[in-house]
Interface confidence: low
């Protein structure tokens, strides 16, 4: 007997062919011998089966000797043996309908688990293999689980169900809710305006929730909440903001924060959390601020940085177009009795300049100028 696999909710077409290429009498029945459909002359007739409103045939193929049974919006319980009776012969087709669904929702937070559950007819013993968008294969029986979802798991998961050497393919679109970047770092000179951006790695029609930015300044003993906000249908409204610093927030996505001035006391690390409506758990993005200051006090030219810098970063002081006078893997460098000219303070990583501040040293009889 021929085996056909179908997908829950889909349409299947079971074929039945006569040797004569003309419209002749046929019937389709189920295993209980209940008539599903057939013909009476050139008209389609339907029997009392449960499939009544979902069963059809391709009337226009009858005169080619083809008498298909089409079952729309397949259900697991449609799994059965279907018998086509035509020209005093019987053709049997076993239909097995499978369904594959994601545990709760197809929109999951980064770090959460995805469980795929296979619905299958009694007596079947299918195997399932799923391939994630990043090419990772997982195998299982009735359930498959993937823990710790990552951003790269967003996209179409392709799952193949195998039964009786036949296969049926399911595609499930999974959206991993996360920020585009887990962490970002902003380098600024003292006094400059700071822009923090928190782009999301997904798009949904309606996005509602609430968020908060906690800040741990390098100089402070504890962290504090800088701003709290609400998100309603992608519109941002500020609920509460500290007086110092007085952050400003954009009204539209992506989430965007502006710090009017980069000051040493603000240098440090922040954690933006976003709790989405109807989701357990929160999205997180870390943001870091590094602030540089170059100063000349009497005969001492100093360059300092505050904030989370890695030990491999190099801080240098150099006279323009000359070799570095001082270069250290430290957060402060200085030069005593600097000669007159334009001095550059550079924070660099493997030769790549991350931050630069210029200070003009005048001959000793005048005061320094900071451009």
């Amino acid at each position: 007997k021929k085996v056909v696999l179908g997908k829950k909710g889909d349409t299947v077409e079971l074929t039945c062919t006569a040797s004569q290429k003309k419209s002749i009498q046929f019937h389709w029945k189920n295993s209980n011998q209940i008539k599903i459909l057939g013909n009476q002359g050139s008209f389609l007739t339907k029997g009392p089966s449960k499939l009544n409103d979902r069963a059809d045939s391709r009337r226009s193929l009858w005169d080619q000797g083809n008498f298909p049974l089409i079952i729309k919006n397949l259900k697991i319980e449609d799994s059965d043996t279907y018998i086509c009776e035509v020209e005093d012969q019987k053709e049997e087709v076993q239909l097995l309908v499978f369904g594959l669904t994601a545990n709760s929702d197809t929109h999951l937070l980064q770090g959460q688990s995805l469980t795929l559950t296979l619905e299958s007819p009694p007596g079947s013993s299918p195997s399932v293999q799923c391939r994630s968008p990043r090419g990772k294969n997982i195998q299982g029986g009735k359930t498959l689980s993937v823990s710790q979802l990552e951003l790269q798991d967003s996209g179409t998961w392709t799952c193949t169900v195998l039964q009786n050497q036949k296969k049926v393919e399911f595609k499930i679109d999974i959206v991993v809710l996360a920020f585009q970047k887990a962490s970002s770092i902003v380098y600024k000179k003292e006094g400059e305006q700071v822009e923090f951006s928190f782009p999301l790695a997904f798009t949904v029609e309606k996005l509602t929730g609430s968020g908060e930015l906690w800040w741990q300044a390098e100089r402070a003993s504890s962290s504090k909440s800088w701003i709290t906000f609400d998100l309603k249908n992608k519109e941002v409204s500020v609920k509460r903001v500290t007086q110092d610093p007085k952050l400003q927030m954009g009204k539209k996505l992506p989430l965007h924060l502006t710090l009017p001035q980069a000051l040493p006391q603000y240098a440090g690390s922040g954690n933006l959390t976003l709790a989405l409506e109807a989701k357990t758990g929160k999205l997180h993005q870390e943001v870091n601020l590094v602030v540089m200051r170059a100063t000349q006090l009497q005969k001492n030219l100093t360059c300092e940085v505050w904030g989370p810098t890695s030990p491999k970063l190099m801080l240098s002081l150099k006279l323009e177009n000359k070799e570095a006078k001082v270069s250290k893997r430290e957060k402060a460098v200085w030069v005593l009795n600097p000669e007159a000219g334009m001095w550059q303070c550079l924070l660099s990583d493997s030769g790549q300049v991350l931050l630069e501040s210029n200070i003009k040293v005048l001959p000793t009889w005048s005061t320094p100028v900071q451009p």
Epitope: D10, T11, E13, S42, F43, D56, R59, S60, L61, D63
Partner: antibody
Framework: EVQLLESGGGLVQPGGSLRLSCAAS????????MHWVRQAPGKGLEWVAV????????YYADSVKGRFTISRDNSKNTLYLQMNSLRAEDTAVYYC????????????WGQGTLVTVSS | DIQMTQSPSSLSASVGDRVTITCQAS??????LNWYQQKPGKAPKLLIY???NLQSGVPSRFSGSGSGTDFTLTISSLQPEDFATYYC?????????FGQGTRLEIK
């Protein structure tokens, strides 16, 4: 959104060959019977060929039988029409169309691709 | 093959008019009759399937009726966007065949 996008049309000499493609998106391509329908300049619509959802059955209009071959690649969501021994009377805009219900009800159509057979 | 004959072959009407186009099949086709609308340079669009069923997204001013050999497409109140060519098509017997079309023009 359902989209059918034909390509491969152009100018060809009588007796020449051409292969048309129709890229489908926005629906379960592998559940639909797919057709080619053509329209000669300033004329009506003429059905050309049909292929079953799984590619197991093909039917052709008498005017193209033996010269045209319809095929599909469900893994690429693409329908094809290989046209050989082309004649001047094959000059037309060729449309691909999907058919989910009873055979011959074209619920979605592509924008068409023009095939001109001329020396 | 089943022959499909539409009438009239062209028709002039004004916005707001009620318009009827008929289609006759050369043999009984039950209710396996579809109607399409085609605008210049565009692909046809399915309006009505199986004689009287309105395709999703099609305005309710379009309606279809008939069974056997005689069928009608009615537009209850013509809108500017309805000026186009209309085709009937049978899907009862192989091969599917179309009527020659009815061109609906602005009066």
């Amino acid at each position: 959104e359902v989209q059918l996008l034909e390509s491969g049309g152009g100018l060809v000499q009588p007796g020449g060959s051409l292969r048309l493609s129709c890229a489908a998106s926005g629906f379960t391509f592998s559940s639909y019977w797919m057709h080619w329908v053509r329209q000669a300049p300033g004329k009506g619509l003429e059905w050309v060929a049909v292929i079953s959802y799984d590619g197991s059955k093909e039917y052709y209009a008498d005017s193209v039988k033996g010269r045209f071959t319809i095929s599909r690649d469900n893994s690429k969501n693409t329908l094809y029409l290989q046209m050989n021994s082309l004649r001047a009377e094959d000059t037309a805009v060729y449309y691909c169309a999907s058919d989910y219900g009873d055979y011959g009800t074209y619920d979605y159509w592509g924008q068409g691709t023009l095939v001109t057979v001329s020396s | 093959d089943i022959q499909m004959t539409q009438s009239p072959s062209s028709l002039s009407a004004s916005v707001g008019d009620r318009v009827t186009i008929t289609c006759q099949a050369s043999q009984d086709i039950s209710n396996y009759l579809n109607w399409y609308q085609q605008k210049p340079g565009k692909a046809p669009k399915l309006l009505i399937y199986k004689a009287s069923n309105l395709q999703s997204g099609v305005p309710s001013r379009f309606s279809g009726s008939g069974s056997g050999t005689d069928f009608t497409l009615t537009i209850s109140s013509l809108q500017p966007e309805d000026f186009a060519t209309y085709y009937c098509q049978q899907s009862y017997n192989f091969p599917a065949t179309f009527g020659q079309g009815t061109r609906l023009e602005i009066k």
